[in-house]
Amino acid sequence: WELTILHTNDVHSRLEQTSEDSSKCVNASRCMGGVARLFTKVQQIRRAEPNVLLLDAGDQYQGTIWFTVYKGAEVAHFMNALRYDAMALGNHEFDNGVEGLIEPLLKEAKFPILSANIKAKGPLASQISGLYLPYKVLPVGDEVVGIVGYTSKETPFLSNPGTNLVFEDEITALQPEVDKLKTLNVNKIIALGHSGFEMDKLIAQKVRGVDVVVGGHSNTFLYTGNPPSKEVPAGKYPFIVTSDDGRKVPVVQAYAFGKYLGYLKIEFDERGNVISSHGNPILLNSSIPEDPSIKADINKWRIKLDNYSTQELGKTIVYLDGSSQSCRFRECNMGNLICDAMINNNLRHTDEMFWNHVSMCILNGGGIRSPIDERNNGTITWENLAAVLPFGGTFDLVQLKGSTLKKAFEHSVHRYGQSTGEFLQVGGIHVVYDLSRKPGDRVVKLDVLCTKCRVPSYDPLKMDEVYKVILPNFLANGGDGFQMIKDELLRHDSGDQDINVVSTYISKMKVIYPAVEGRIK
């Protein structure tokens, strides 16, 4: 019996087609992805093949103005329209709190939403019961397939799930649910979830009875053969893991942003064992037409977005200096504003010993693309912020050793004076440079804000200590020459859309007046 698994993950509000790098579509003839194009390909496969499942491994939420405005209603609407069969909860599904998940998505979805390792307690247990499930048995052709969900247990550090959801260890939580499926006579089981490729592989290895793992969170691109676009494969598609009980378990992921549709064909024997698996992600490029009815619906929903862009988010009573003459040479107040917003967006009081789990921010000055003049009545709009942060990136959470941070700050000024983008703006960091010294030895003082303290204060950076830092995904991926971050990071979790982080902070503060205050000397 053959099953076709179509899968997406980490779509992050890319409902409309995007450019090749998943930013805003500029030249339509070269754009990719989007739900209208995805639907065309899904329907084509549904018509051609008998047993097809369309699955999403989480993080539909967060990433563009679509989410900012529609807050998840767009996810439910278009996933319903595409007739997804199931979705696993990702960490970003909790970005607007549990209510921001329940109201727009859980109540409206016409497909099961899954996570076996999230347990509700207190009054929330009743409120949310039955709206997401640990697993679901789906009829496919003449057979039934069990789908069991999982979500990163780091979610409380990455999003806003509140205090009434417990995120358990994935493997510990999955095993009894898989065992339950076996007692229900279900012998074909897919683990669908959002914990990253390393955990996907562990689940394949450790959870008895799981036949296939469909993952997300780490934006992993797998491919067999010559890849069709810019993404470099982390391994073959599917990636085969040998389980502890000797089975070959295919593990897949489909990069991110709706650029690819994962396509995996699995052959099962009559006892539900995987005989063979093969496939590849399908690049959703312009050779695949956008479905006209979905496209028309997208255009209808778009209208509200255009109106939103020009609405006032808040006011500034000072000039927000985002000029390259400032931000690539010295501390600039636009950099301070953005870093303050980045830290504010990551306030998570999950431990009494810590005032927060992260206190530091770094931001490449070259990523700040425009100032905002306060003389326009002080008004700040989404449109203004899109000029400051035009690249559609995210502000991510990483863990780095102090020694890596020291290297990053040396790189920040290794060719100072040439107006290059690697000059770092900061938050929760005091850095002193001596530019008379030779490159690689210019950082003379580097103090960082403590986290394990009730009164935050600055202490000297310790080379062997592990620190959490918020930074643009561009830097996490080694951009602007920060190869040491990419090579030496100990953990990387993708965060919220950059503009959304800053816009939320400005809306919260209402009036802002960031200063240049001696963070960089």
Epitope: S129, G130, L131, P139, N185
Partner: antibody, heavy 120, light 107 residues
């Protein structure tokens, strides 16, 4: 299109038995459960029980444990409910309804109903 | 067994009216609640499952909501084809139980 077609009306004497059938089409019979519900005149709907035609697991409402016997013939895609030791209070319309395999959601398609009249 | 108390038992309304039917559960059933419609001929159709979720093909004028153990079916603008009996039904624990029904009649 999912269809559940039930057998025709039955008139039975007290103490007799009756077997009501429910023929499923438009879907894979073993991929869903089958539930039985009764509606007696002037009474609220009552759930009798369900059968999983894949595993043949059966769950009864305790009230009907000695009254109803649920079976299924997968080759004929048909579910059956036999009612024994009929009494006048068993006079009702009996419905079959397709249920979720794992019972997380409930009966989504219903048969047209079979009227069973118990009269001497 | 979980008791489902449905009210009103009957109501008269006109086309275009907003109609609400409520159901109270005797204990916590979470969101494990269906709303069913029974037309005069006897045919039963599920309208809403999991308290809020509309079955496919069911008009959007039907909606479900909840406050604690009280569940509400709302018909925002009654249409001629909506005159029927409506039942709530819990599937949180065995035996599954039904409300007593609400007959929606033409005024």
């Amino acid at each position: 299109e999912v269809q559940l077609v039930q057998s025709g009306a039955e008139v039975k004497k007290p103490g007799a038995s009756v077997k009501v059938s429910c023929k499923a089409s438009g879907y894979t019979f073993t991929s869903y459960t089958m539930h039985w519900v009764r509606q007696a005149p002037g009474q609220r709907l009552e759930w009798i029980g369900y059968i999983n035609p894949n595993s043949f697991y059966i769950e009864y409402n305790q009230k009907f444990k000695d009254k109803a016997t649920l079976t299924a013939d997968t080759s004929a895609s048909t579910a059956y409910m036999e009612l024994s030791s009929l009494r006048s209070e068993d006079t009702a319309v009996y419905y079959c309804a397709r249920g979720d395999y794992d019972l997380f959601y409930d009966m989504d398609n219903w048969g047209q109903g079979t009227t069973v009249t118990v009269s001497s | 067994d979980i008791q489902m108390t449905q009210s009103p038992s009957s109501l008269s309304a006109s086309v275009g009216d907003r109609v609400t039917i409520t159901c109270r559960a005797s204990q916590d059933i979470g969101n494990s609640l269906n709303w069913l419609q029974q037309k005069p001929g006897g045919a039963i159709k599920r309208l809403i499952y999991a308290t809020f979720r509309l079955d496919s093909g069911v008009p959007s004028r039907f909606s479900g909501s909840r406050s604690g153990t009280e569940y509400t079916l709302t018909i925002s603008s009654l249409q001629p084809e909506d005159f029927a009996d409506y039942y709530c039904q819990q599937y949180a624990s065995f035996p599954w139980t039904f409300g007593g029904g609400t007959k929606v009649e033409i005024k």
